[in-house]
């Protein structure tokens, strides 16, 4: 049985009744707000295995583990999500663990975890297993594990019997429970699913099945559902739904959600029935359930009630999907986000004309603005204080406004503000000054020339490498010494390193917006002898690694024709030499007869070079009969200090301070300080956190039904 | 996948209040769709009685207006008819039935009410 | 309220034949939107009405090619190009484009 279009369970816990017979819901479930601590234990719902949108829990008493409840839950769509997320477990007071011990997909969206104060099992599960990406994965102030003493099933009686996977570079067992296994499937069996017996399902199967190799047997399917068969398309005369079943036209045609209420009823477009003509279609004629192209872009004017917009995730970009004319003010502040360009530009690339003002602030998951790919007028009807009409402040990691040479943008009233954009050179500023018509406008402190481009690569002459010699923890490298019009201006120069496996580095990488510079950095003072060619020893490196290496001309600040110059260079990849390995991983014995031990082991993590043989040594060894005394495994003898309150722990957000063995007669040295980024990241981070309370709250309180 | 089950007394008396209920599983009433009462009385044709929408709003056959409430509770997913002071000429089987953007596509499988003392 | 009157009550067939059935609205039946919310329905002796056309002429995925409608405006038609024994039952139009929503009185279909 289909349930949907979403199930809200609240305040009493036998709502939980209406879960019965589903096998799929169509929808999101929500169980939230459960205050009075009940017994789950009789509620079991075998039936269901897949939510097409997401799952959200928060603030349910007494519930200790999703298991019991959704024993066969499969597989998370993903197909909407909850601000990003496609599971959220959200202050659940009581959860032991999660429990899912079926849950083999999340087909989009992450994961986030968060103010479970019991909650343990969660270092055990290998998510990547489960989700494409686990970078946006947000695990934090749950019980911090070491207070957990989780153990996979059958660690303590030394008969492992749960697979490893590496997470973080620690080997480990992955499981659900103290008696539940995370399954994996056979590596033979690819990026298909497998059964409870490990034979490999049909190609067109996600999560699992019941029969190997049978697409009528699946327990989800990887594209469409369609009269009991997994189908990689919908078959003629049937159209895609909600992102996973093939329905006919009939259906579609009678659709009346509480969400297309207002719209003259679904479409069926590319093969799909949806609530709306997709962009660059428009319906053709008032009732037709069909779409035509529309001459140029479709025109859709969008209001917010508000007056300003809030972009701070793709589930508030979503709500401008196919809109041209927004009629009020944008405020941007995207701070992370999985594949965020191209979900944002998905749902706002179609705006071509704002009629206040648009604001990006605090937006660090953003490199460039070209999502808002049609933006062509921006009105400035409504302006900010000061008479802003485009306001760009503390954006870390904003190189690129858009491409100006394939862009025509007007700002027809109002100024613009630049501030606090480090990676944001001032010549894109000025490029934009010319192109929106606004040069003249801008006061001398609205383009903040000192921390616009701070960090950006606005340079214009090239400096060149001379040398370079390598070993194997070591790079020297020199260049040319770079001769500005005034030499007074050169001050010193910048090395720009980091390690970098493949030759596509660019200078701005790992600043894909959500991180801070990728890049080591180290100042170079430049040589008394003018005829001495500046250079420098890049120490503490790794054996046999490829780096990529840059160097920038540290000059002050020279205005030429409104650009200011420098000098750098294009990135060099250079590979320290061989080194001794590190010590082999995983080392196991066991014997087989009497006279034969069977060693096994797991390359070193560090291989330092190219590996050509191991050499193994042995020697007999006295037997402690002392190790047989106690039993260090025992799962009560692991001490539980303290009950964790579901704040978030600080231990888990940073790092420890690590106490250093100085050289000399020093001793230990003290920790050190937080740096400003540091302290501004944790700022951020608890922002992040306040934003996405406030949307779960926005979102599941309502007012009481009449 | 859709289903709806009607359920209430078979036998209402003159002048009472004739109370059924249509439990709805497979889908949330407040999701979308019209959620109808039809009847039948028997030997004869289908009469519509009204109908509460997703949001809760209610329409109902003017000559049975003064009389007819169909309300819902949300968390048991289920709605209801009420119809006060009835007379032999309510006697018919009632269905509860649902309606989309164009036509009913699920259909209870109806109870019969008989007014009798 | 608009009334909703079918024409002929009873209808004997043969199966094989064709036969047609009639239903007149007292008004126009076409929405503000331009659609017309008519459907015919048939119901088979002891169970609930099951869907067969809607908006006049779109026949439900799954039902017989033989069963086709038309009409416009306060005039439509069923039509059953030739009749089978599974096709007895009463056949109901509805309008649905205007509240309070009305059915017809009911053909009954019958084999001669």
């Known amino acids: 049985e289909i349930c949907g279009p979403g199930i809200d369970i609240r305040n009493d816990y036998q709502q939980l009744k209406r879960l019965e017979n589903c096998t799929v819901i169509e929808g999101y479930l929500h169980i939230l707000l459960i205050s009075k601590a009940e017994d789950y234990r009789s509620y079991r719902f075998p039936k269901l295995t897949v939510i097409t949108e997401y799952l959200l829990l928060f603030r349910v008493a007494g519930l200790e583990s999703l298991g019991d409840l959704f024993p066969n839950l499969t597989v998370i769509r993903g197909w909407k999500l909850f601000y990003n997320y496609a599971l959220v477990i959200f202050e659940m007071t009581n959860l032991k663990d999660i429990g899912l011990y079926n849950l083999r997909n999340i087909t989009r969206g992450a994961i986030r975890i968060e103010k479970n104060a019991d909650l343990c099992y969660l270092s055990t599960v290998d998510w990547s297993l489960i989700l494409d990406a686990v970078s946006n994965n947000y695990i934090v102030g749950n019980k911090p594990p070491k207070e957990c003493g989780d153990l996979c099933p059958g660690t303590m009686e030394e008969k492992p019997m749960c697979e490893k996977t590496t997470i973080n570079n620690e080997y480990n067992y992955r499981c659900w429970t103290t008696n539940r296994c995370q399954k994996m499937c056979p590596s033979t069996c690819g990026k298909r699913a497998c059964t409870e017996n490990n034979e490999c399902c049909h190609p067109e199967c996600l999560g699992s099945c019941s029969a190997p190799d049978n697409d009528t047997a699946c327990v989800a399917c990887r594209h469409y559902y369609y009269a009991g068969v997994c189908v990689p398309a919908c078959p003629p005369n049937t159209y895609r739904f909600e992102g996973w079943r093939c329905v006919d036209r009939d259906f579609c045609a009678n659709i009346l959600s509480a969400e297309s209420s207002d719209s003259e009823g679904f479409v069926i477009h590319d093969g799909e029935c949806m609530q709306e003509c997709p962009s660059g279609f428009i319906r053709n004629g008032s009732q037709s359930m069909y779409c035509i192209p529309c001459e140029g872009p479709c025109p859709k004017v969008c209001e917010e009630e508000k007056k300003t917009k809030t972009i701070d995730s793709v589930t508030s970009a979503q709500m401008l999907q196919g809109c041209t004319i927004f009629k009020g003010n944008l405020l941007i502040n995207i701070r992370r986000g999985n594949n965020i360009a191209s979900e944002l530009e998905n749902f706002m690339g179609l705006i071509e004309v704002v009629t206040g003002y648009v604001k990006i602030r605090h937006s660090h998951a953003l490199v460039s603005l070209s999502f808002l790919k049609n933006l062509r007028l921006i009105l400035g009807e409504e302006q900010l204080e000061g008479n802003y009409s485009f306001y760009v402040l503390d954006n870390q990691n904003l190189q690129q406004l858009w491409d100006w040479d394939h862009r025509n943008l007007t700002i027809k009233a109002g100024k613009m503000y630049f501030a606090f954009n480090p990676k944001l050179c001032v010549s894109e500023i000025y490029r934009m000054e010319e192109v929106t018509g606004t040069k003249g406008r801008q006061s001398k402190g609205d383009i903040n020339t000192r921390n616009n481009g701070e960090r950006a690569s606005c340079e214009s002459d090239v400096l060149h490498f001379t040398s370079t010699t390598t070993s194997k923890n070591r790079i020297i490298i020199t260049w040319h010494r770079y001769r500005p019009p005034d030499y007074r201006d050169l001050i010193s120069f910048t090395v720009y390193y980091k390690e970098a496996p493949f030759k596509n580095v660019t200078e701005y990488d790992g600043q894909d917006a959500c991180g801070s510079n990728s890049w080591n950095m180290v100042d170079v003072d430049l040589p008394p002898n003018k005829d001495v060619e500046p250079g420098i020893l890049l120490h503490g490196l790794k054996p046999w690694t490829q780096y990529a290496v840059y160097v920038k001309a540290v000059t002050l600040t020279m205005v030429e024709n409104d650009h200011i110059r420098g000098a750098k260079s294009e990135i060099l990849y250079i590979r320290t030499n061989a080194s001794v390995p590190s010590i082999p991983l995983d080392v196991l014995s066991a014997s087989n007869s009497s006279s034969q031990l069977i060693v096994k082991w797991n390359p070193p993590s560090l291989p330092n070079g190219n590996l050509s043989y191991y050499i193994v040594r042995w020697q007999r060894q006295p037997q402690d009969g002392y190790l047989y005394r106690h039993n260090y495994c025992s799962k009560d003898k692991i001490p539980i200090r303290k009950y964790a309150d579901g704040t978030i722990d600080i231990e888990e957000v940073t790092e420890n301070p690590k106490t250093e063995v100085c050289g000399g007669e020093k001793g230990p040295c003290c920790a050190c300080p937080k740096t400003e980024a540091e302290k501004q990241a944790e700022k951020e981070e608890a922002e992040y956190r306040k934003v996405f309370e406030n949307f779960l709250h926005n979102s599941i309180f309502v007012p009481r039904p009449e | 996948q859709v289903q709806l089950q009607e359920s209430g007394p078979g036998l209402v008396k003159p002048s009472e209040t004739l109370s059924l209920t249509c439990t709805v599983s497979?889908?949330?009433?407040?999701?979308?769709?019209?959620w109808n009462w039809i009847r039948q009385p028997p030997g004869k044709g289908l009469e519509w009685i009204g109908y509460?929408?997703?949001?809760?709003?209610?329409n109902y056959k003017p000559s049975l207006k003064d009389r007819v409430t169909i309300s819902r509770d949300t968390s048991k997913n289920q709605f209801s008819l009420k119809l006060s002071s009835v007379t032999a000429a309510d006697t018919a089987v009632y269905y509860c039935?649902?309606?989309?953007?164009?036509?009913?596509?699920?259909w209870g499988q109806g109870t019969l009410v008989t007014v009798s003392s | 309220d608009i009334v909703m009157t079918q024409s002929p009550l009873s209808l004997p067939v043969t199966p094989g034949e064709p036969a047609s059935i009639s239903c007149r609205s007292s008004?126009?039946?076409?929405?503000?939107?331009?659609?017309?919310?008519l459907q015919w329905y048939l119901q088979k002796p002891g169970q609930s009405p099951q869907l067969l056309i809607y908006?006049?002429?779109n026949r439900l995925y799954g039902v017989p090619d033989r069963f086709s409608g038309s009409g416009s405006g306060t005039d439509f038609t069923l039509k059953i190009s030739r009749v089978e024994a599974e096709d007895v039952g009463v056949y109901y139009c509805?309008?649905?484009?205007?509240?309070?929503?009305?059915f017809g009185q009911g053909t009954k279909v019958e084999i001669k």
């Open positions: 039935a649902r309606y989309g953007r164009v036509f009913f596509d699920y």
């Open positions: 497979g889908y949330s009433i407040t999701g979308g769709y019209l």
């Open positions: 509460i929408s997703y949001d809760g709003t209610n």
């Open positions: 008004q126009s039946i076409v929405h503000s939107n331009g659609n017309t919310y």
């Open positions: 908006k006049v002429s």
């Open positions: 509805f309008q649905g484009s205007h509240v309070p929503h009305t």
